[in-house]
């Protein structure tokens, strides 16, 4: 049979290297030789390229080399397939060389901030050595912060006569390290070069961009003064590398601004002892370049009643995230403060906090929380300068099976009855929320039975046992990840009862 007609002809001019055309050869049953017929020099010259490879994949491509390549130029390319049964020709295809030229990537040699110009870096590069002299080049510059994975892109063109191979990238974050890569193409071409090697550069430092402020209210002391732990951190979106030399804090009773107290610190928290009335606390951070905007927080009076609006709250794990959702009865509340810390018996030292706006849910990556640890999560509604009553739940980012089973005892042994009691597993050993307990019991040499009860029950009465019979009993505590048995206990039912 005749060979299949070559289809899908595609050509690329790897600038000053070769012009390579490829095609789909079709299913060939016998050896097929391909000849690429070309007219070039605007139709004034023609020649052929014959595939000479024995492997079928390599036979579907052929290259023309310098100096028989001109640009600009118009080519016609036709592929002939020939086997023992005859010759078949492809459609004639037409190519403008400028439209299919592909160059080497440019080389970035410097990425630097421009003195005195904020939030900008200047990229300097060398044009690819092999690029058409007669064509303008278009560029794509892609950039990302060092700790991000998603690229942003900008496109621009450079005139071929432009000696200045630089681009000013603006609208960046201050004092942030960026990764830059550049690619180029002949302006008329559909083929982009590969990306250049990546280069790093950093924007200039600025004054700190702001703070987020929060507090932990503690019970009033005997003298009526109340300890308030102030916590703060860089505002969301602040540069990762932003430097702070220190913090200025000032506070005063709401009723009297004249009683302002001020203090400085380099820590990221501060314990204040305030009177029972309401207070305003303000603070700024500063570095060698200036001060941040002021962050302000109102501390309510001890006897002040806080509003309540969260009706229900639940936590679940979805796609590597812990998701907390709640419902609110107050439509005008759209800012919430989330606090979370591990539920350990000692005083929590690692309180984390974060605000949420325009949403009634909060997510955190599972890997930001310790697996198998119970966390206390509280959500505070915030309306203007008022902080509402929190709603708290406990949750695990990842559950495991308990590391030990319940400590079990047998009580009230009767002829046919017995009471099995067990203790809660210590918090540190639970590894998850205990959802139920299962009591396994079995008469010596007999059939085993089990009974599951919910996690609020810590004892269970077994009935209809055989008199004067040895039993083995074991209690299993289960989380969503599975269960762990406690130690097994043996007991023997009585042969008769005082009531018999």
């Amino acid at each position: 049979a005749l060979p299949a007609k070559p289809e899908n002809i595609s050509c690329v001019y790897y600038y000053r290297k070769n012009l390579t055309c490829t095609w789909s050869p079709g299913k060939e049953t016998s050896y097929t030789q391909y000849t690429v017929k070309r007219t070039y020099a605007f139709g004034e010259k023609h020649d052929n390229c014959t595939t000479n490879s024995s492997t079928s994949e390599n036979r579907a491509s052929c290259s023309f080399f310098l100096p028989r390549i001109t640009i600009p130029d118009n080519y016609t390319i036709e592929v002939e397939a020939e086997n023992g049964d005859g010759v078949i020709k492809s459609h004639m295809t037409y190519w403008r060389l400028e439209n299919i030229a592909k160059t080497e990537p440019p080389k970035i040699f410097r990425v630097k901030p421009v003195l005195g110009i904020k939030r900008m870096i200047q990229i300097e590069w060398i044009k690819p050595e092999l690029a058409p002299v007669s064509s303008d080049l278009k560029y794509t510059l892609r950039f990302r912060t060092v700790n991000s994975t998603s690229w942003m892109e900008v496109n621009f063109a450079k005139n071929r006569k432009d000696k200045n191979q630089t681009y000013n990238l603006t609208g960046l974050q201050p004092f942030t390290e960026y990764v830059i890569a550049l690619r180029c193409a002949v302006k008329e071409s559909k083929f982009w070069s590969d990306w250049s090697q990546e280069k790093m550069g950093m924007t200039e430092e600025e004054a700190p961009c702001g703070l987020e402020l929060w507090r932990v209210l503690k019970p009033a002391e005997a003298d009526g003064r109340r300890p308030v732990r102030l916590l703060w951190k860089k505002a969301r979106g602040a540069p990762v590398l932003e430097k702070t030399l220190g913090y200025n804090i000032w506070y005063y009773p709401e009723s009297n601004t004249n009683l302002t107290e001020t203090m400085n610190t380099t820590n990221q928290q501060l314990e204040l002892h305030l009177g029972g009335e309401s207070f305003w606390v303000s603070m700024i951070s500063y570095n060698s370049l200036g001060k941040s905007p002021v962050a302000t927080l109102r501390i309510p009076a001890i006897q002040e009643k806080s509003f309540q609006c969260i009706e229900v709250m639940q936590a679940c794990v979805a796609e590597d995230q812990l998701v907390v959702k709640w419902q609110s009865s107050a439509l005008d509340v759209n800012t919430w403060m989330i606090e979370w810390f591990p539920d350990v018996d000692s005083e929590p030292t690692t309180l984390s906090w974060e605000s949420v706006s325009q949403a009634t849910n909060w997510t955190i990556q599972q890997d930001k929380l310790k697996p198998f640890w119970c966390y206390n999560i509280s959500v505070y509604p915030m309306l203007h300068d008022k902080v509402g009553e929190p709603y708290s739940i406990q949750a695990y980012a990842k559950e495991g099976v308990p590391s030990e089973g319940p400590e079990t005892k047998v009580e009230n042994i009767g002829v046919k009855t017995v009471t099995i009691t067990w203790k809660e597993i210590p918090k540190s050993e639970r590894k998850g929320i205990i959802c139920n307990y299962t009591i396994f019991y079995q008469a010596e040499g007999g059939k085993g039975f089990s009974k599951t009860v919910n996690s609020s029950i810590l004892q269970y009465g077994l009935e209809s046992l055989k008199r004067k019979t040895s039993y083995i009993v074991q209690v299993m505590a289960s989380t969503s990840a599975g269960g762990t048995n406690g130690t097994s206990i043996n007991f023997k039912t009585l042969s008769f009862s005082v009531f018999e």
Epitope: N18, R68, I71, D73
Partner: antibody, heavy 121, light 107 residues
Framework: QVQLVQSGAEVKKPGASVKVSCKAS????????MNWVRQAPGQGLEWMGL????????DYNPQFQDRVTITADESTSTAYMELSSLRSEDTAVYYC??????????????WGQGTLVTVSS | DIQMTQSPSSLSASVGDRVTITCQAS??????VAWYQQKPGKAPKLLIY???TEAQGVPSRFSGSGSGTDFTLTISSLQPEDFATYYC?????????FGGGTKVEIK
């Protein structure tokens, strides 16, 4: 800037071979064909052949086909022209010349300074 | 092979003169002709290619014309530094061939 520097003058006996080198700088060596042209004393220019350093492809003037070998070493950006079975009429200045423009292949844009080869018994 | 016939083989002219050199190809070579200038003891220098495109850095007094088989190099106003030998060359395809040269001398 683009520069082609050729090896020094040679004196050879008839029947011998000569190998002239041409070191390129200031551009991507593999991106341009390198031609060899000779000029006998008081005579015109005669094209001998070329090499494409990218793929090693050569193209020779049939007049020299049997005696000339043009090679290129990408690692040193150097082209070589070897002419064998020398006779007295091969006495000439031998030039390497880089292929020039995108829109004008086979134009000799940049030339080496020339190497005088004298064939004499 | 394509033969290139150049004329005249030499000419005398004065500074400021308009000089014309012609070259004839033995077959149609469209506009694939280049012109070179060579001074004694020096390598040739490319002036014109594609019959009429000036090479980089070449003074505008040099111009080329023609297509098919007949080509011309014109120096509109001869300068002292233009006294040299001029060669035409076809760059249609290999083998490349040159004209015999035209020596431009001071009158």
């Amino acid at each position: 800037q683009v520069q082609l520097v050729q090896s020094g003058a040679e004196v050879k006996k008839p029947g011998a071979s000569v190998k002239v080198s041409c070191k390129a700088s200031g551009y991507t060596f593999t991106g341009y064909a390198m031609n060899w042209v000779r000029q006998a004393p008081g005579q015109g220019l005669e094209w001998m052949g070329l090499i494409n350093p990218y793929n090693g492809g050569t193209d020779y003037n049939p007049q020299f086909q049997d005696r000339v070998t043009i090679t290129a070493d990408e690692s040193t950006s150097t082209a070589y022209m070897e002419l064998s079975s020398l006779r007295s009429e091969d006495t000439a200045v031998y030039y390497c010349a880089r292929d020039g423009y995108d829109d004008g292949p086979y134009t000799l844009e940049t030339w080496g300074q020339g190497t005088l080869v004298t064939v004499s018994s | 092979d394509i033969q290139m016939t150049q004329s005249p083989s030499s000419l005398s002219a004065s500074v400021g003169d308009r000089v014309t050199i012609t070259c004839q190809a033995s077959e149609d070579i469209y506009s694939f002709v280049a012109w070179y200038q060579q001074k004694p003891g020096k390598a040739p220098k490319l002036l014109i290619y594609n019959a009429q495109t000036e090479a980089q850095g070449v003074p505008s007094r040099f111009s080329g014309s023609g297509s098919g088989t007949d080509f011309t190099l014109t120096i509109s106003s001869l300068q002292p530094e233009d006294f040299a030998t001029y060669y035409c060359q076809h760059h249609y395809d290999s083998p490349l061939t040159f004209g015999g040269g035209t020596k431009v001398e001071i009158k």
